[in-house]
């Protein structure tokens, strides 16, 4: 499938309105510091370009590479020394190490200001004013903060900003229509840039086996009704696509997830009954649609595993045949199976199944060795049940807040080395865990939550290997991608911490806090807390418990006196006082 | 390519056996479960039995059940049919197929890849 030109090919694929949507994600998310005009610049010379290969695909420079036309468009920036300080390297090298080089230098927590909100109005006037900028530069400034956000995707949540204000610039009252939608994006926005940003981990620092691993149990809970070869061909195809956006090519990525879409919509008999609602919609829409679709039903007349796995005279002879194909169908005959399990916990018994047939099949009596097999899953099935039932109890017993709190509190005392900001991050998203899973019917608990944790602890091992403190958390992040939650589980508190020596201007509040969103107050309270566990560690849950609750007396005394920064200079003191007495 | 062939049909009185074998190429056999059907003079087709992957689970019409065997060989990348105490109504052209879909319950069944077929008689 070689064409004479590869940007005329994807031009002539995607269109012009996808492919300059696609790269300028791509160039937002290589140099996320750069503004918003130069970007709107390199996209148009590029745009052009691409114009003159469809015209001309012998014309010059257009048999050139994606990676090569894209990467001698980003040199071409003039400030790329004084922005980027090292990334200019990059442009000394040759490709394919110029794209790699670009890769590693995307960065998961860009130093950029947090996007205002403009008021409704203004915002409705910048929208009929120039929609096509408009359009683009929500396009910019979320892939620059996201710069593994899935770009097919991406294109998705710019059409529905768009409809949102298409809609609500008309209504009567503009606000109340528009800002619950510009939430629910935002809401959806992050938490797909989170889902992403597992799957690029996992196929970069795990590789591709790995992730194929993790969509074989995936697709095979939502198409049990499917054969396994059915599912190996969605599983290569899906891992073609998501290496491609992992990896900068966003236009191959986005053509490939187009035609799997397609392949999927023509083959629906073959693969699940659930994917005709999908497949009436418009691309963008129907991509999404597919990739969310719910579970398949399970055929009713699945016969037992143990027959294949641990009855059958040629298990070792199957699995010596061909081991990846082996345990690929034993991941997908179990996950099938059993859609009330998590995937991470699917791949962890497919990982003991493996071990278990490395031992047993080079014993003296192979059959005798893994007999009981399926007995060894138990206690890894037990361990995230009960994990879900105890933290479901206990967010109903507390609420969000709090249940958050519990979490800042378990983790800090973990791994106390972390900065303040993402265990406040961290803590915050894997509290939500709550409201997101513990209202679901018991067979859709475990996969909800453990399946979220694991993309909520990524993002603390992204940050983490971003500025390395803590040994255990470069330990959890990097032995076992499927094991990641249980290690964080099992740590307890760090005996070998130093506690952090007591600074009063870390407790020092003021007047502003009063004008603070409700959000926004219980960042700073939940800041306080983790500063508070790294100076007393050994604090008990009732200590700790005194000092939040006094906090939330002192400041809501002050923010209702007349004059509130006096109050807070007056009452903050003592405060911090009767804190380091009550730790004491 | 994806081949199918077909062998072991041809003549046999009634009560008597015969064994078809399918020989597979162009594709990893092992992946597929694979299935046996049949048509007859005249009429439509019918599924016969289907076999699993390794050859654990097998399924039959009722009209063959506990008379036709099916089993497979991996390592030979071949199926086989052993068809006993055979009847007059197992006239039919017999052919080997690759299931694309199979739901036992819901009757759904696809299959993507056919041999040419081997015709067995059953007449005294």
């Known amino acids: 499938d070689t064409h004479k030109s590869e940007v005329a090919h994807r031009f002539k694929d995607l269109g012009e309105e996808h492919f300059k949507g696609l790269v300028l994600v791509a160039f937002s998310q290589y140099l996320q510091q750069c503004p918003f005009e130069e970007h709107v610049k390199l996209v148009n010379e590029v745009t052009e370009f691409a114009k003159t290969c469809v015209a001309d695909e012998s014309a010059e420079n257009c048999d050139k590479s994606l990676h090569t036309l894209f990467g001698d468009k980003l040199c071409t920036v003039a400030t790329l020394r004084e922005t980027y300080g090292e990334m200019a390297d990059c442009c000394a090298k040759q490709e394919p190490e110029r794209n790699e080089c670009f890769l590693q230098h995307k960065d998961d927590n860009p130093n950029l200001p947090p996007l205002v909100r403009p008021e409704v109005d203004v915002m409705c006037t910048a929208f009929h004013d120039n929609e096509a900028t408009f359009l683009k530069k929500y396009l910019y400034e979320v892939a620059r903060r996201h710069p593994y956000f899935y770009a097919p995707e991406l294109l998705f949540f710019a059409a529905r900003y768009k409809a949102a204000f298409a809609e609500c610039c008309q209504a009567a009252d503009k606000a109340a229509c528009l800002l619950p939608k510009l939430d629910e994006l935002r809401d959806e926005g992050k938490a797909s840039s989170a889902k992403q940003r597992l799957k690029c981990a996992s196929l970069q620092k795990f590789g591709d086996r790995a992730f194929k691993a993790w969509a074989v149990a995936r697709l095979s809970q939502k198409f049990p009704k499917a054969e396994f070869a059915e599912v190996s061909k969605l599983v290569t195809d899906l891992t073609k696509v998501h290496t491609e956006c992992c990896h900068g090519d966003l236009l191959e990525c986005a053509d490939d997830r187009a035609d799997l879409a397609k392949y999927m919509c023509e083959n629906q008999d073959s693969i699940s009954s659930k994917l005709k609602e999908c497949c009436d919609k418009p691309l963008l829409e129907k991509s999404h649609c597919l990739a969310e679709v719910e579970n398949d039903e399970m055929p009713a007349d699945l016969p037992s595993l143990a027959a294949d796995y641990v009855e059958s005279k040629d298990v070792c002879k199957n699995y010596a045949e061909a081991k990846d194909v082996f345990l690929g169908m034993f991941l997908y005959e179990y996950a099938r199976r059993h859609p009330d399990y998590s995937v991470m916990l699917l791949l962890r018994l497919a990982k003991a199944y493996e071990a278990t047939l490395e031992k047993c099949c080079a014993a003296a009596d192979p059959h005798e060795c893994y007999a009981k097999v399926f007995d060894e899953f138990q206690p890894l099935v037990e361990e995230p049940q009960n994990l879900v039932k105890q933290n479901c109890e206990l967010f109903e017993q507390l609420g969000e807040y709090k249940f958050q709190n519990a979490l800042l509190v378990r983790y800090t005392k973990k791994v106390p080395q972390v900065s303040t900001p993402t265990l406040v991050e961290v803590s915050r998203n894997l509290g939500k865990v709550g409201a997101k899973c513990c209202k679901l019917p018991e067979a859709k608990r475990m996969p909800c939550a453990e399946d979220y944790l694991s993309v909520v602890l990524n993002r603390l091992c992204v940050l983490h290997e971003k500025t390395p403190v803590s040994e255990k958390v470069t330990k959890c992040c990097t032995e076992s991608l499927v094991n990641r939650r249980p290690c964080f589980s099992a740590l307890e508190l760090d005996e070998a911490y130093v506690p952090k020596a007591f600074n009063a201007e870390t407790f020092t509040f003021h007047a502003d806090m009063c004008t603070l969103s409700e959000k926004e107050k219980q960042v700073k309270k939940q800041t306080a807390l983790v500063e508070l566990v790294k100076h007393k560690p050994k604090a008990t849950k009732e200590q700790l418990k005194g000092v939040m609750d006094n906090f939330a007396a002192f400041v809501e005394k002050c923010c209702k006196a007349d004059d509130k920064e006096a109050c807070f200079a007056e009452e903050g003191p003592k405060f911090v006082a009767a804190s380091q007495a009550a730790l004491a | 390519e994806v081949q199918l062939l077909e062998s072991g049909g041809g003549l046999v009185q009634p009560g008597g056996s015969l064994r078809l074998s399918c020989a597979a190429s162009g594709f990893t056999f092992s992946l597929y479960r694979m299935v046996w059907v049949r048509q007859a003079p005249g009429k439509g087709l019918e599924w016969v039995s289907m076999?699993?992957?390794?050859?654990?689970?097998?399924y039959y019409a009722d009209s063959v059940k506990g008379r036709f065997t099916i089993s497979r060989d991996n390592s030979k990348n071949t199926l086989y049919l052993q068809m006993n105490s055979l009847r007059a109504e197992d006239t039919a052209v017999y052919y080997c197929?690759?299931?694309?879909?199979?739901?036992?319950?819901?009757?759904?069944?696809?299959?993507?890849?056919w041999g040419q077929g081997t015709l067995v008689t059953v007449s005294s």
């Open positions: 197929a690759k299931v694309r879909s199979w739901d036992q319950t819901g009757g759904r069944r696809t299959f993507d890849y």
């Open positions: 076999i699993s992957q390794f050859g654990n689970q097998t």
